[in-house]
C-alpha cells in the first residue's frame, strides 16, 4: 500500500525532539501554498490553504515518520498552529510507483483576509536538541476583499465589496465640482474628497433613505483648479467604520447641459481596512 | 523483460565532447531515476549522477559537475549523458543503470568504451 | 561523502570454499547497502540489496548480512562462476559511492 498522511493539531514540540537520532530523514524538497475555498453551513465560504510538500527522493525518507507544519499568522494580531502529518506507511520506494516524487498536502489552516503568513514544515524525526535540522518556509500573503474570491465573502460584503457607486464627478465652476453616486443600503454616511496632489474640497454626505439604492448628489467647493482631480468616496458601514472599501473618480468639466457624464474608469481601492 | 541499450564505443580528441545514449524498455521509463556510473580501465567503480525521468531533476556527484550533461527523452524512453572537454583520463567505460526502489541498481547498460586520445 | 572501506582487496579460493568479504562505512547508512559482480568485459550485477535481500536470479549461496557501519557478503560454497570482482554500494543518498573491490581468485 502507498503511504498516505493522517495529519492532526500538535501545538508543542514533537516528542521525538527529545530522543537522540543519529540519522535523521532528508529536508523537504518543496513546499507550497495555495488558498481554496470551502463552504461552511452559514451560506458563506471560507478561505483554507493547501499546503502541499515534496519528499527528497532517496532512502533517508525510509526513516521518515511524520511532516509537521507551522504556521504564523500576521495581521492586527498573531496566531500560530501547528499540525503533524503522520505517514501511515513505511516508504518503500523513493519515488511513487507511478513515477514522480512523493507529494502530500494538507487543506484545514484558514486563511483571514490580507493577512501575511509563514509556513514551515520539517521532517520528524527532527533534529536532536542542540542542533539545527532541516526545514523549509514558504510566505503566502491572503488577499483582501478586493480580491475576485474573496469579494464574496458575507464578511467583505458587509465592506461594500459589491457594491458600485458609479461615481460621476464634473467641474461645474472654478469654485465648485458636482459628485453624483449610487448609494448602498449598507450604509448611510459618506465623504467625498477632492485631490489634486493635496485635498481641495470635501464634504460629508448623509443619505437617510438608507434602505433605498439611490443616486445621490452633492456640490463641494474646492480652493484650486479641480479638473482632473480626484474624488475619493469613503463609505462608513457599521461592520468596517472608516476603514471600509473607498472608490475613485475622475473630475471632468461639467457638459454645457450641467449634467454630469457617467466616467469608464471608476476605480476601487482599498482604504486601511481590507477586511 | 528490462532492458537497457547503450550506444557504442567511442573515440575522441581531447577536448572534444561525446554523447551516450541507453535506451531502456520492458518498464515504465518515468517511474525508476537513471544513474550514470564510470570505469576507468583497471579501476572501481564510479558514480557520476542520477537523472529522474519524470521531471528531469539531476543530482550529481560533485566531482563530475563540470563534466556530465544528463538528459532525458520521456518519448522513446532514452537517457543521455554528454561529456564535454574530454581528457585523457576521461578514458573509461561509462555504464546506464536503472535505480530499483531506492537506489541500488538493479539493472545495467552493457556499457559504453569512450576512448580519449589524440 | 560516505566513505566505503572493502576488505580484502583481493583473496584466493577454491571451488567449495566459503567466502566472506566485507566494508565498512565511515557512516551508519542504516543497511542501504547494495553488493554487486562483475566478470571482466561485462557491466556490474545485482546480488544484494538492503544488505540482505537477494536480486532477482541471485543464487541462495550468497547472502548478506550486516547493520549500520559494518557489513558482509557471504558466499557459503564457492561455485566456478563465482570468480570475479565484488563490489559494495551505499544507496544512504547522494552522492553514491562504491567499495574499491574486492578480486576473488581461483587458488
Known amino acids: 500500500r502507498e503511504p498516505t498522511v493522517q495529519c492532526g493539531s500538535e501545538t508543542g514540540p514533537s516528542p521525538e525532539w527529545m530522543l537522540q537520532h543519529d540519522l535523521i530523514p532528508g529536508d523537504l524538497r518543496d513546499l507550497r501554498v495555495e488558498p481554496v475555498t470551502t463552504s461552511v453551513a452559514t451560506g458563506d465560504y471560507s478561505i483554507l490553504m493547501n499546503v502541499s510538500w515534496v519528499l527528497r527522493a532517496d532512502a533517508s525518507i525510509r526513516l521518515l515518520k511524520a511532516t509537521k507544519i507551522c504556521v504564523t499568522g500576521k495581521s492586527n494580531f498573531q496566531s500560530y498552529s501547528c499540525v503533524r502529518c503522520n505517514y501511515t506507511e513505511a516508504f518503500q520506494t523513493q519515488t511513487r510507483p507511478s513515477g514522480g516524487k512523493w507529494t502530500f498536502s494538507y487543506i484545514g489552516f484558514p486563511v483571514e483576509l490580507n493577512t501575511v503568513y509563514f509556513i514551515g514544515a520539517h521532517n520528524i524525526p527532527n533534529a536532536n536538541m542542540n542542533e539545527d535540522g532541516p526545514s523549509m518556509s514558504v510566505n503566502f500573503t491572503s488577499p483582501g476583499c478586493l480580491d475576485h474570491i474573496m469579494k464574496y465573502k458575507k464578511k467583505c460584503v458587509k465592506a461594500g465589496s459589491l457594491w458600485d457607486p458609479n461615481i460621476t464627478a464634473c467641474k461645474k465652476n472654478e469654485e465648485t465640482v458636482e459628485v453624483n453616486f449610487t448609494t448602498t443600503p449598507l450604509g448611510n454616511r459618506y465623504m467625498a474628497l477632492i485631490q489634486h496632489s493635496t485635498i481641495i474640497g470635501f464634504s460629508q454626505v448623509f443619505e437617510p433613505h438608507q434602505k433605498k439604492q439611490t443616486r445621490a448628489s452633492v456640490v463641494i467647493p474646492v480652493t484650486g483648479d479641480s479638473e482632473g482631480a480626484t474624488v475619493q468616496l469613503t463609505p462608513y458601514f457599521p461592520t468596517c467604520g472608516s476603514d471600509c472599501i473607498r472608490h475613485k473618480g475622475t473630475v471632468v468639466l461639467c457638459p454645457q447641459t450641467g449634467v454630469p457624464f457617467p466616467l469608464d474608469n471608476n476605480k476601487s481601492k482599498p482604504g486601511g481596512w481590507l477586511p | 523483460e528490462v532492458q537497457l541499450v547503450q550506444s557504442g564505443a567511442e573515440v575522441k580528441k581531447p577536448g572534444a565532447s561525446v554523447k551516450v545514449s541507453c535506451k531502456t524498455s520492458?518498464?515504465?521509463?518515468?517511474?525508476?531515476?537513471m544513474n550514470w556510473v564510470r570505469q576507468a580501465p583497471g579501476q572501481g567503480l564510479e558514480w557520476i549522477g542520477r537523472?529522474?525521468?519524470?521531471?528531469?531533476?539531476?543530482q550529481y556527484n560533485q566531482k563530475f559537475k563540470d563534466k556530465a550533461i544528463l538528459t532525458v527523452d520521456t518519448s522513446i524512453s532514452t537517457a543521455y549523458m554528454e561529456l564535454s572537454r574530454l581528457r585523457s583520463d576521461d578514458t573509461a567505460v561509462y555504464y546506464c543503470?536503472?535505480?530499483?526502489?531506492?537506489?541500488?541498481?538493479?539493472?545495467w547498460g552493457q556499457g559504453t568504451l569512450v576512448t580519449v586520445s589524440s | 561523502d560516505i566513505q566505503m572501506t572493502q576488505s580484502p582487496s583481493s583473496l584466493s579460493a577454491s571451488v567449495g570454499d566459503r567466502v566472506t568479504i566485507t566494508c565498512r562505512t565511515s557512516?551508519?547508512?542504516?543497511?542501504?547497502l547494495a553488493w554487486y559482480q562483475q566478470k571482466p568485459g561485462k557491466a556490474p550485477k545485482l546480488l544484494l540489496y538492503?544488505?540482505?535481500n537477494l536480486g532477482d536470479g541471485v543464487p541462495s549461496r550468497f547472502s548478506g548480512s550486516g547493520s549500520g557501519t559494518d557489513y558482509t557478503l557471504t558466499i557459503s560454497s564457492l561455485q566456478p562462476e563465482d570468480f570475479a570482482t565484488y563490489y559494495c554500494?551505499?544507496?544512504?543518498?547522494?552522492?553514491?559511492?562504491f567499495g574499491g573491490g574486492t578480486k576473488v581468485e581461483i587458488k
Open positions: 543503470a536503472r535505480s530499483g526502489g531506492f537506489d541500488w541498481f538493479a539493472y
Open positions: 537523472i529522474d525521468p519524470y521531471d528531469s531533476e539531476i
Open positions: 520492458g518498464y515504465t521509463f518515468i517511474s525508476y531515476w
Open positions: 538492503d544488505a540482505t
Open positions: 557512516e551508519n547508512i542504516y543497511s542501504n
Open positions: 554500494q551505499h544507496f544512504w543518498g547522494p552522492p553514491y559511492t
